[in-house]
Interface confidence: low
């Protein structure tokens, strides 16, 4: 008799794929056109990325450092009207994209939480949660919570409001902290909070160190659902050497949890790579005309248009990974096991019951390496086969679907491989 199928875990929508942050509406849409109506026209692009949620804003009225002139219930007219926002929500819903609203209060100011008036700000946030939940948003983000006094108790209260409205709503908190103890203490009082931090960016970017960071994090947070990013708001290029971008995309999409990206991560957008741009919000490069100030500053391979036409581009890789992440059970909610491999490598398996299994091998080093996979430290339920089929490589030249012998597996410098193999009873 066939073995019984393992019962599927309860899956919330944010478990099923990546979140995409648009912190600056104007920079995302390009010069002079950054409003909610314009963003509606970019939803097809977000659909093509197969992201499950859009983390948007802040959009509310905020006069720098002035609590009285900060209204979390009012959209800044520069971004559009409440009606524009409602239209965006409706359009996003039709495309199965959830909208998460950033309510970080003093986003134009020095201290994002008006440090001297925390209580009155907390009340404003509470009212805003109720208001925007009724308006139909799918969740909220608040950032820089290390600067919020009594953050844990406020977050617990805000999570209760959010979940009290519907278990299907999400609260995301962001911190600049990379300290695991601090992160764990924030998570302990909030059962369903998604926390973004700088934890992974505090790395020497070697295979061994990254493996140890990931395993320590997962051990410390137990079996709770987590998110993966390199920061609470920044671009991957601000934290990573260029040659590791593809590797990290592969890793973020295949670790157990929700990958969180910022607009432009999918094309390798660089902060302040072009003259006169604000560091924190570079203009999204849709095509070669996105930066008209300096003719020739933008080449096709830096842009969404150029990369969409190139199957070997970072954007194409992002789309493929996002597609795999959103449809394969082992990547959606599978168990995770690391195992020994050659120096400089980080290797792990994702598997769920009798579904197709995935092997990820990441070479962080600048030299080609034999994978040296040693599966002796894997549980019997996750044993390695002799061969696995290539789903994708972060480097050009390998053919998708080709069977690779795991014993003789070699990786190019900075190459990551995603391989699949069937469950065998």
């Amino acid at each position: 008799r066939a073995p019984r199928c393992r019962e599927l875990p309860a899956q919330k929508w944010w478990h099923t794929g990546a979140l995409y942050r648009i912190g600056d509406l104007q920079a995302f849409q390009g010069h002079g056109s950054g409003n909610l109506a314009g963003l509606k026209g970019r939803l097809d692009y977000l659909s093509s990325l197969k992201v499950k949620g859009l983390v948007l804003g802040p959009l509310h009225k905020n006069q720098k450092d002035d609590v009285a002139q900060t209204d979390l219930l009012q959209i800044d007219p520069n971004f559009g009207s409440k009606e524009d926002f409602d239209n965006l929500l409706q359009s996003a819903k039709k495309k199965s994209i959830r909208v998460i609203l950033d309510l970080t209060p003093n986003y134009r100011g020095e201290n994002l939480w008006f440090s001297t008036q925390v209580d009155s700000v907390a009340t404003k946030v509470k009212d805003a949660l109720e208001f925007w939940l009724q308006a139909g948003v799918d969740g909220f983000q608040v950032r820089d919570i290390e600067n919020l006094k009594d953050a844990s108790s406020f977050l617990a209260e805000w999570e209760n409001i959010t979940k009290g409205f519907s278990e299907d709503r999400l609260l995301i908190a962001g911190t600049n902290s990379s300290d695991l103890q601090q992160i764990v203490s924030l998570l302990e009082s909030n059962k369903d909070l998604l926390l973004t931090s700088s934890y992974l960016s505090d790395s020497s970017f070697t295979g061994e160190h990254t493996k140890s960071l990931v395993t320590q994090y997962l051990n410390a947070t137990g079996n709770r659902w987590c998110s993966w990013s390199l920061s609470q708001a920044g671009l991957l290029t601000s934290f990573l050497p260029a040659q590791l971008l593809r590797l990290y995309q592969l890793m973020l999409f295949t670790l157990p949890g929700t990958p969180v990206f910022s607009y432009g991560d999918e094309i390798g957008l660089k902060a302040a790579a072009l003259p006169g741009q604000p560091v924190e919000a570079p203009v999204m490069l849709w095509d070669e005309s996105s930066f008209p100030d300096i003719p020739g500053a933008v080449s096709a391979n830096m842009t969404v248009k150029g990369q969409s036409e190139d199957p070997g581009s970072l954007l194409s890789l992002f789309r493929q990974l996002s597609d795999q992440r959103s449809k394969e059970r082992s990547l959606l909610h599978g168990d995770f096991h690391t195992f020994s491999s050659g120096p400089g490598l980080f290797s792990y398996i994702r598997h769920w019951d009798q579904n197709e299994r995935f092997l990820v091998v990441l070479n962080f080093g600048d030299v080609g390496l034999s994978a040296g996979l040693q599966a002796s430290d894997l549980p019997a339920s996750a044993s390695l086969p002799t061969k696995a089929d290539l789903v994708l490589s972060t480097q050009p030249g390998r053919e998708e679907g080709s069977p690779l012998e795991l014993e003789r597996l070699k990786l190019e410098p900075h190459e990551g491989l995603l391989l699949r193999f069937p469950y065998v009873a």
Epitope: D310, P311, G312, S316, Q320, D389, L392, S393, Q395, P396, G397, R398, E399, E400, G401, S402, P403
Partner: antibody, heavy 118, light 107 residues
Framework: QIQLVQSGPELKKPGETVKISCKAS????????MNWVKQAPGKGLKWMGW????????TYADDFKGRFAFSLETSASTASLQINNLKNEDTATYFC???????????WGQGTSVTVSS | DIQLTQSPSSLSASLGERVSLTCRAS??????LSWLQQKPDGTIKRLIY???TLDSGVPKRFSGSRSGSDYSLTISSLESEDFADYYC?????????FGGGTKVEIK
């Protein structure tokens, strides 16, 4: 724009050798695998195999092991198919077509007709 | 090897008519299927990949869909340049295999 341009038609006798070339332009040849596909007159398409343009390693389908050889001249952005000891049943049009990951066979050459007749 | 059974092998249709071609896979191919068009002059063009994604520049009258192991190519309203041979291709595993082809002719 992306193009695969193949060499012209060939008329050969049985036992001879033919070499067909496929020149890639508009992209870097080493970023994409190159497949070869056979179409006999009035028949459908048959996959012959592919060459990993990054490593140069060829893979042949079972029916095309032995007399068939894929090669690569990276500096000239050109892939080639050589057929040795030609037989009448090799009469066909041969296509090159690029592929990478799930973008398999997205661009095709115009085809090269090979006629084998004594 | 994975067999792709394409039907019908030929069909006659009029301009403006809606036509559907089907391709059945003998094993699971998880949506890794493309549709190709071969014009009378022999040139081959990919129309659809990943079962339903339209290649850029391909007219919207072409669409692809999947139902289990059956994959379909639909042309919503035939135009004169659509009279050609159509092949399905699976790229889920090696060797790559093609369907036997469907010839779409003018009635």
């Amino acid at each position: 724009q992306i193009q695969l341009v193949q060499s012209g038609p060939e008329l050969k006798k049985p036992g001879e050798t033919v070499k067909i070339s496929c020149k890639a332009s508009g992209y870097s040849i080493t970023n994409f695998g190159m497949n070869w596909v056979k179409q006999a007159p009035g028949k459908g398409l048959k996959w012959m195999g592919w060459v990993n343009t990054y490593t140069g390693e060829p893979t042949y389908a079972d029916d095309f092991k032995g007399r068939f050889a894929f090669s690569l001249e990276t500096s000239a952005s050109t892939a080639s198919l050589q057929i040795n000891n030609l037989k009448n049943e090799d009469t066909a049009t041969y296509f090159c077509t690029r592929s990478v990951i799930t973008y398999t066979m997205d661009y095709w050459g115009q085809g090269t007709s090979v006629t084998v007749s004594s | 090897d994975i067999q792709l059974t394409q039907s019908p092998s030929s069909l006659s249709a009029s301009l403006g008519e809606r036509v559907s071609l089907t391709c059945r896979a003998s094993q699971e191919i998880s949506g890794y299927l493309s549709w190709l068009q071969q014009k009378p002059d022999g040139t081959i063009k990919r129309l659809i990949y990943a079962a339903s994604t339209l290649d850029s520049g391909v007219p919207k009258r072409f669409s692809g869909s999947r139902s289990g192991s059956d994959y379909s190519l639909t042309i919503s309203s035939l135009e004169s340049e659509d009279f050609a041979d159509y092949y399905c291709l699976q790229y889920a595993s090696y060797p790559r295999t093609f369907g036997g082809g469907t010839k779409v002719e003018i009635k």
